[in-house]
């Protein structure tokens, strides 16, 4: 078990913070929540603390929770390919271009770390490029979320790793909005952290209202697990 | 509590250049990032550039890449802003700023601040 991975064996607190800036419309939104990494679940309530949001809420699931994946589940035969819990609680620094198909695009940095028992998740979003009526400005996204891959590999020069994934996006009129995202990731503090083998992490997220909520926010239920790696051939003659 | 004080500021005519520096005590900064953030009078503080103590990684505004340059002088806790080719749009209160992790653009990500030092070119 690494030092981090032993922040993360019960319940832990979740914050989130964003400033985003998309096409000069300026926003900032706060989350609350949970994160259990024995069951890789997370339980998140986001609010826009500027009035509406200016882009749907699904663009912003993989800069929110695709951001803590801490609390990944990483099952015992592949604990020695968590990079995101051994980096902990320095943290590690999360920095995505998100390029959405015949449109705009995303860039985030992120900084993920423990302020005292309470992960922080911090970001900063520009996004440029987007067509006034399209997808994403024109608000022409379900509000709901697709089950993704999230393939993972070791970047060695820079003590951390890269990773790439395509979100799709449903739209009203039933076609599908590609979202690719290219990740990097890389600790903030000195020490060791774990450099993985290729593999990937299945996510699996719902979105729903709180009733009693007047303002602009999502509410997320998340479960990611990793996988892609079998068991080490010792393990099949146990 | 940590202290920033910075200095090197003053009155400089277009295309010259001044080096602001930042001395920063109260702690030890291994995984800080120390920035420069600069205001005029009725508009918010915008980032300048920004460096982490390792010195991996940095950050330029586009209206100053190229003719600003951020560096770090670890074994003296002091970051320094070197300014070449200034411009009167440059004319700002700057400062200096730390926080622990990495480097934002956002200014309420930032913990510790400086007083401010004046640059004006004419």
């Known amino acids: 078990m690494s030092k981090g991975e032993e922040l993360f064996t019960g319940v832990v607190p979740i914050l989130v913070e964003l400033d985003g800036d998309v096409n000069g419309h300026k926003f900032s939104v706060s989350g609350e929540g949970e994160g259990d990494a024995t069951y890789g679940k997370l339980t998140l309530k986001f609010i826009c603390t500027t009035g509406k949001l200016p882009v749907p809420w699904p663009t912003l699931v993989t800069t929110f929770s695709y951001g803590v994946q801490c609390f990944s589940r990483y099952p015992d035969h592949m604990k020695q390919h968590d990079f995101f819990k051994s980096a902990m609680p320095e943290g590690y620094v999360q920095e995505r271009t998100i390029f959405f198909k015949d449109d705009g695009n995303y860039k985030t940095r992120a900084e993920v770390k423990f302020e005292g028992d309470t992960l922080v998740n911090r970001i900063e979003l520009k996004g440029i490029d987007f067509k006034e009526d399209g997808n994403i400005l024109g608000h022409k996204l379900e509000y709901n979320y697709n089950s993704h891959n999230v393939y993972i590999m070791a970047d060695k020069q820079k003590n951390g790793i890269k990773v790439n994934f395509k979100i799709r996006h449903n739209i009203e009129d039933g076609s599908v909005q590609l979202a690719d995202h290219y990740q990097q990731n890389t600790p903030i503090g000195d020490g060791p952290v774990l450099l993985p083998d290729n593999h990937y992490l299945s996510t699996q997220s719902a979105l729903s209202k709180d009733p009693n909520e007047k303002r602009d926010h999502m509410v997320l239920l998340e479960f990611v697990t990793a996988a892609g790696i079998t068991h080490g051939m010792d393990e099949l003659y146990k | 509590q940590v202290q920033l004080v910075e200095s090197g500021g003053g009155l400089v005519q277009a295309g010259g250049s001044l080096r602001l520096s930042c001395v920063a005590s109260g702690r030890t900064f291994s995984g800080y990032a120390m920035g420069w953030f600069r205001q005029t009078p009725g508009r918010e503080r915008e980032a300048v550039a920004a460096i982490t103590w390792s010195a991996h990684s940095t950050y330029y505004s586009d209206s100053v890449k190229d003719r600003f340059t951020i560096s770090i002088d670890n074994t003296r806790n002091t970051g320094y802003l070197q300014m070449n080719s200034l411009k009167p749009e440059d004319t700002a209160v700057y400062y200096c700023?730390?926080?622990?992790?990495?480097?934002?653009?956002?200014?309420?990500?930032?913990?510790?601040w400086g007083q401010g030092t004046q640059v004006t070119v004419s």
């Open positions: 700023t730390v926080r622990h992790g990495t480097w934002f653009t956002t200014s309420r990500y930032w913990t510790d």
